[in-house]
Amino acid sequence: SQVSQNCHNGSYEISVLMMGNSAFAEPLKNLEDAVNEGLEIVRGRLQNAGLNVTVNATFMYSDGLIHNSGDCRSSTCEGLDLLRKISNAQRMGCVLIGPSCTYSTFQMYLDTELSYPMISAGSFGLSCDYKETLTRLMSPARKLMYFLVNFWKTNDLPFKTYSWSTSYVYKNGTETEDCFWYLNALEASVSYFSHELGFKVVLRQDKEFQDILMDHNRKSNVIIMCGGPEFLYKLKGDRAVAEDIVIILVDLFNDQYFEDNVTAPDYMKNVLVLTLSPGNSLLNSSFSRNLSPTKRDFALAYLNGILLFGHMLKIFLENGENITTPKFAHAFRNLTFEGYDGPVTLDDWGDVDSTMVLLYTSVDTKKYKVLLTYDTHVNKTYPVDMSPTFTWKNSKLPNDITGRGPQ
């Protein structure tokens, strides 16, 4: 049956899916606060522009008794149940915000007409790439992959004079939703990362990882993993590590590395941390007061989703264009809008662009220092520290093949 969109005559509604299964274990109340804060800003901006319209959000909750795992494993059915709920209520907003799980987003995208935009805080997997009406406001796996390939190939920096073409990937199946899909993308045999590397092996057991650290017959000096320093310590502990091992720790949504009083533990000296450029300092807004760094990014993506909708609504209303059209549904890409905390850029496929930062541990100060940054929008690396105080020989990253490192 045809679902009508509550999206005309000066009244514009946002459908927000409040799913029990979520990319991050965030209390739904915090997400509601983020959405409501976003609505206040959107209303103010529309009012400033002389647009006298009403913008509201409808929160749609799924049945927690059926879908209560709390993670993304059972999210496929939950997403479809929520779509059924919308269909039964015969009521849909101008835009759908949520879901955040890759499984549910993929399935919901397949099962819906492309007549309205979907905005997701998550949906990290490659299966959600290149979806015409899907916008993702947290860095998807494709962006990570492109950085890694770019960095592997780089050989003209004072601290990296070798191109790399090999890697181990540690993936034990207990990862968080973001890490699961990041590593899944690296593992996939048809992915860009796999295509560009000559050798890649996935390590699935703790012991496999631990053995590689000192194995003279290892096929690569580089190991990619995903998680925080504590996750690495549980795995690596204080074990000795061969001097030409480089661990790349992907920890995008964690800005603890940039806090003034943070000292890098000793076990991080062989590690390069890949994270996102820290968000601008948030004031005590109602939704961010008690959030951890990761959850802050998740809640902020919800808030920015509301601001993105407001941005597009304003443009279409000012141009006298209809909101309930395929043109509107396909418009949430290739633009920059005013996010809560600064400019947010979306690429041609509606995926957020960002500045990734590669950190190293200074052997002098035991602090995390920025080695280089990478702009996902232009796929370009910008060296920052031309004379890093590395643990590696000659303050250069070693070759990725054992025995051919800097002499």
């Epitope: 809560y340 905390d341 400019p343």
Partner: antibody
Framework: QVQLKESGPGLVAPSQSLSITCTVS????????ISWVRQPPGKGLEWLGV???????NYNSALKSRLSIRKENSKSQVFLKMNSLQTEDTARYFC??????????WGQGTLVTVSA | QIVLTQSPAIMSASPGEKVTMTCSAS?????MHWYQQKSGTSPKRWIY???KLASGVPARFSGSGSGTSYSLTITSMEAEDAATYYC?????????FGGGTKLEIK
Amino acid sequence: QVQLKESGPGLVAPSQSLSITCTVSGFSLSRNAISWVRQPPGKGLEWLGVIWTGGGTNYNSALKSRLSIRKENSKSQVFLKMNSLQTEDTARYFCARSGYDGFDYWGQGTLVTVSA
Amino acid sequence: QIVLTQSPAIMSASPGEKVTMTCSASSSVNYMHWYQQKSGTSPKRWIYDTSKLASGVPARFSGSGSGTSYSLTITSMEAEDAATYYCQQWSGNPYTFGGGTKLEIK
């Protein structure tokens, strides 16, 4: 109606710091970003920095090390602080309501002269 | 940082004459805004989002362009249009102004 008003010291000695307050009315700082712009006598406009609705900031990269912008939403005030002033920092300093559709409202500006 | 170059720096036009000034960006930008400033006053937003006229701006003004090339046009110059016009972008860093075009009446 929307108004912005800058208040500053007028005269600042070289190497000293500058503090200017922008007091706004007719709109909320929790819904609108504010930029600072300056204009040396007889010259063009130079954007200094912006404070976003959420309190985050971006600065002109050439001046980043000397600038800081903060705000108090409840007092409807935005503060610009600039360190190590030199004579070339003599200018009229404006605050302006900022969005991605430009700077739609400006204050009248406050003239800052850097001189011994 | 995106650099905006306005040309000409100074120009004069007779009443009724068509006027076009340009703003060139060092790399592609999404939108361009234009401001009018008369001597001793604050700038006023004049054209925003490349082509939209700010409130109270006469219909003889128009803006156009995309990528790295933008322009402001006055179809029929009037005395009150004499002022300095600045272009400004919000695609990088996030803001920069052009050096201005001073428009005088002949």
